[in-house]
Structure formats: structure tokens, C-alpha cells
Interface confidence: low
Amino acid sequence: SEGRKTWRRRGQQPPPPPRTEAAPAAGQPVESFPLDFTAVEGNMDSFMAQVKSLAQSLYPCSAQQLNEDLRLHLLLNTSVTCNDGSPAGYYLKESRGSRRWLLFLEGGWYCFNRENCDSRYDTMRRLMSSRDWPRTRTGTGILSSQPEENPYWWNANMVFIPYCSSDVWSGASSKSEKNEYAFMGALIIQEVVRELLGRGLSGAKVLLLAGSSAGGTGVLLNVDRVAEQLEKLGYPAIQVRGLADSGWFLDNKQYRHTDCVDTITCAPTEAIRRGIRYWNGVVPERCRRQFQEGEEWNCFFGYKVYPTLRCPVFVVQWLFDEAQLTVDNVHLTGQPVQEGLRLYIQNLGRELRHTLKDVPASFAPACLSHEIIIRSHWTDVQVKGTSLPRALHCWDRSLHDSHKASKTPLKGCPVHLVDSCPWPHCNPSCPTVRDQFTGQEMNVAQFLMHMGFDMQTVAQPQGLEPSELLGMLSNGS
């Protein structure tokens, strides 16, 4: 799915050596210039230009400090493992002047029985083992330390936690003679937090647990547990928040029902039902109590688990999420779409929008896509004129101000941003789509016609003539 969109990726930089206990060299002064965007209410462009100029002027003094790489640290506690028993780990880039910590959970589907886990191990070993992980990763999108790429939290301590447990970050079972694979997703998060406390997280003001796709669902499943863990360890002052990207799925009726044969075609409810048993999956306690034994699978679905969560969570979800469409057996192969499928897709967008109506902090563009927050161009998409980094900044402010009695949204700083137009890519800022076969970029008008949308039907609710709509869409307005 990723191949259809045009996202810029930066090249890797040469790897520095690994660090087991991060710290400045003895006697080395620890300096940084933390900037807080809460103070910036004027011209953001002008401010960003000043920041860039400052960064460039400081670059010669501290080229090493601007290294974008996050470095790999395998867990010291090697009993907390990936599926194959190799130690789990995390990539870290510290920002010594900042008390903000961003922990990002990687995504990558799941497997829920011996057969499809064996197949996953053969084809996607990186998602089941740490053996071949690179020593460094470049932080992109919300993990970038460049203010232009990450105007939201560029100065934070960045942690990327690779997904190697195949359990939607929910498992709590180790590898044994009986179990061919370990499923320790929930335990990996706990152990990473435990080790990070020894690397400066203990001084954090805010911990933002973020994730995309299965990692986004992982945020919903683990955010309260992380907050509880920090409280128990004596750090109640660390504010734990969640950012769930592309992990808010619906347990809706599939477009075409298929038997539960593999990860992709199995209906999400059935896949998770089987998975929980196979992984010894754990779900948030308050959610678990709402369902009978054996019905814990319900807690993997955002709209069911969200109301039970105590931590603030910001939900980012494309209204026409490609992973959702895949599990619903909707495969857009490049052939024009029949009316039944078109209505199914539109209804999906409507249902998703409905589940977000009571989620105060949400960003849901009407696009056909999957994942956004660690894309380099995550700043480009807007909903009602507001970009995602701006919405997250407004969310931070709203949480900062929430001790005040007023519950009214901050003026000019919205956090509930859900597109209301009813068809895929009706938002002109959606990521560019490519024709799967020719590789050609398509503008929105081409895409909609390609999808079989009749311009008359699309234009009418907007009070436009088809020719006017085509003109608007072709100009990207």
C-alpha cells in the first residue's frame, strides 16, 4: 500500500557506536536550547525561519548534536524477547535539554497461529527477531529532530520501539518447549520504560506513547498500563499521553466474507479472538471488566476501549484506511469500482466518522491511505485548514490549560478535526495516489473517476456543477 503514495525519505547517515548507558562525557557541559511552541502564536513561518537560521548558525559548533540517528539498544534484561527469543530493544536519540519523551511503537500486522507465524518468520523476519536490526535508524516525521520536518516535538527525546512480537503489542507469553514463539509485546513496552528510566526518562514531564497501525492499537492497549507502571515506580508526576495513528479499526461487516485462513483475509474480530488466546494477550483492565471472559477481543477496537482509558489519547485515522479496507476484503486493483463497493467504501468513512464524534482530540482526513506520523511529509495534510502538528500543539495546550475550569476549545486552536466530505480524497491535501500498474501519479479527479465515482453524484451535495468540481479538484483546491 505504501508504494502507491509519494513520501520523501532521507538517506541513512553513518552509524555511531552503540551506547549502553547514555550520558555526557565526564566533565562535558550539557547544554541545549529547548524551545516551547506554546509561546508562538504569531507568524509560524517567520518563527520557523528564525529557528532554521539559528540551527544553521549553530551547526558548525555542534555537528554531532544534529545527527539524526537513533541508536539501537538491546534490552539488558534479555528474558524480554522478540518472537524468536532474541532480545527486544529500542532506538534512542536523547535531547538533553528536553523533558519530553516520545516513545513510538512500530506497526506491521500480526500473526495468530503457528502456520501464519511460521510464514511471517520466513518472509518478514525483522518483525519477529532482533538479529538483523540495523545499529541506527533515521528519525522521520514526528521522530525527526529537524524543526522543519517536525514542528511539533522536534526537541523531544526520541525512542523508536521496533515491533518484533507480532501480537499487536498485547502479548505476555515467553518462548518455551510448548510455545514455538514468544509473544511479549506488552512486556517489551514495560521493560523499555523501565530501562529508559535509567537513561533520563525519570526526569520527564511528558511521556507521549505513539504508534502507527498495529502500533497505534498498541497505544490504546498499553497507555494506561504505562501510566500505572510509572506511578508504581514512584514517578506519578510524569504525564502519560497517547497518540494512536491508523490503529482505530472497526469490527464491521466485511465487504465479502471469507474464511479465516490467513492474516489478511481473516475478519478482524476472528483474528484477534484467536490471537489473544495464542499470545496470552492482555488488555486494559477497565476495558476487560466491561466484557465477559473470552470477549476481551472487543478491547482491541478503538471505539470500545477508548471510553475506558484514563490517559488523554489523540486519535489519528484516515477515514478510508487501507488496512481496514484490506481486512474488509476490499482490494482496489485499478479496475473501476462497482456501485456496491463504492457505497461500502463511503459507508465505511461514515461509520468511522461516527465513532470519532465523542473523541475530543482527533484528526481524520478523508483520504485513502495508511499511517502518517512518521512520514516525512506528515505536516502536509490538513483538515479544515489545520495540519496535524498544529492540532497536536493545540492538544498540548488544551491539556496544559485543562486545570482551568473552562472546557471550551481554545480559540483558533482546534483539536477535533474530522473531515465531513463523504468520499476518498475529497480533501485536496491528501497524499498523492499512484496508479498501481503504471506508477503514474493521479490527481483527485482522475482518482475519483478511476474509482468509478460519477462526478454528477459527487458534485451535487457540494452544490457544484461537475465541471466546476473537476476544475477545483484538478487545481488541488
Partner: antibody, heavy 119, light 111 residues
């Protein structure tokens, strides 16, 4: 000058307790993970315990788990090892050592303090 | 636990010759391009002193006649040319997993 100085060793009865200390100087103590490593007379080196820079994470060798407690006082640049239920096989020279950031090796060692468990 | 075996308990080498001390791990101590094996020198009545870290990196202040090599399970410490002050016991140590373990040591004697 970077230095670690252990103290508090001595003769202890089997089943008894002892707390040994390690004073650090010449470096930012609170930034480093620290370990205790011991060496029985005429024997090799044995890792005993680890504590992270902020005191949150601790790990122990199975031989001492439940009996020894590693702790630190970052304000006073001091590392401790509280030993209880001591056995004759705990008789050793106890070294405190600093963990380097690059990969879990010990780049600074103290001169050691001797703990003898005997009746 | 990862067991480190130093096959030679002692080794006698003439001044100016090469001393080769080996260490074998019961399972690989390499990961992600790094080998978590380190070497220390210990003289009687003194604490150990770090010589080589991450298999092949020379600790600052250590003479260049010391070198380390190897990956996976087999590692070697070389001293060439051997000098009088090199008479000591040499230990390997891994940090690939917990518990951290040391080899039993190889005593280098001068002929």
C-alpha cells in the same frame, strides 16, 4: 582524576550482614551505570550486580539474588552493596566498577574491599 | 547463561614474541554488527584493567601492541611484541546478555 574507592569490608559470621560502599570522584557519577564485581581468593572474576544511573533499574547474579541489594546515592556520589545471609562462598574481594556507555564493559575499577565470611 | 571458555589456563611466551589468548562463548555474543566481548588485564594485588572493548577497540592509554579480534563465538587477544610488564592474568568478558560473565582467565608468563 577518575577514582572509585571501596570501603566497609571485613570479617563477618555466616548468616550475617554487611554493607560495603564505593565513593566515586572525578566524573559525573549520576550519569553512569555502576556494577559490583567480586573475586574469590585465587579465583576468577564474577559479576554480582548492576544499577542504572537513575537508580531505577537493578539486576543481580542468580548466586546473590534475594540476599544482596545494590543502591546508590547520586547526591553523595556513592554506590552501596547491602549483603545479607552471607555464606562462606561470598568470601571475596569486592570491586565496584563503572559501566562505559558503549556496550556494557567496565572502564574504571576501584582497588576493592575484602569481605571474609567465616566463623 | 553464556559461558566463556579460555582454553589455556596459562601460557609461556618469550620476550618480543607474540602471545595469543583465545576465548570461546557458548553462544554468539555478536548482534547488529557489534561483538560484545571485552578483555581485561589483572596483575597480582591490583584490580582488573580494561584493554579492549567491543572485541577490537583499544582502550585509550593501552599500548598498541595489544589487539583484539573475532566475532560470534570465537575471540582472540593478541600481544605483540610481548614485554616484561605484560606478565599478568587476562580475562575475557561478554555483555551480550544477563548475567554478564567472565572467562576463567589465562595467566601469561614470560619464558
Amino acid at each position: 582524576d577518575v577514582q572509585l574507592v571501596e570501603s566497609g569490608g571485613g570479617l563477618v559470621q555466616p548468616g550475617g550482614s554487611r554493607k560495603i560502599s564505593c565513593a566515586a570522584s572525578g566524573f559525573t557519577f549520576s550519569s553512569y551505570g555502576m556494577h559490583w564485581v567480586r573475586q574469590a581468593p585465587e579465583k576468577g572474576l564474577e559479576w554480582v550486580a548492576y544499577i542504572s544511573s537513575s537508580t531505577v533499574t537493578t539486576y543481580y547474579a542468580d548466586t546473590v539474588k534475594g540476599r544482596f541489594t545494590i543502591s546508590r546515592d547520586n547526591a553523595n556520589n556513592t554506590l552501596f552493596l547491602q549483603m545479607t545471609s552471607l555464606r562462606s562462598e561470598d568470601t571475596a574481594m569486592y570491586y565496584c566498577s563503572r559501566q562505559n556507555w558503549d556496550g556494557g564493559y567496565f572502564d574504571v575499577w576501584g582497588a576493592g574491599t575484602t569481605v571474609t565470611v567465616s566463623s | 547463561d553464556i559461558v566463556l571458555t579460555q582454553s589455556l589456563a596459562s601460557l609461556a611466551v618469550s620476550l618480543g614474541q607474540r602471545a595469543t589468548i583465545s576465548c570461546r562463548a557458548s553462544k554468539s555474543v555478536s548482534s547488529s554488527g557489534y561483538s560484545y566481548m571485552h578483555w581485561y588485564q589483572q596483575k597480582p594485588g591490583q584490580p582488573p584493567k580494561l584493554l579492549i572493548y567491543l572485541a577490537s577497540n583499544l582502550e585509550s592509554g593501552v599500548p598498541a601492541r595489544f589487539s583484539g579480534s573475532g566475532s560470534g563465538t570465537d575471540f582472540t587477544l593478541n600481544i605483540h611484541p610481548v614485554e616484561e610488564e605484560d606478565a599478568a592474568t587476562y580475562y575475557c568478558q561478554h555483555s551480550r546478555a544477563l548475567p554478564l560473565t567472565f572467562g576463567a582467565g589465562t595467566k601469561l608468563e614470560l619464558k
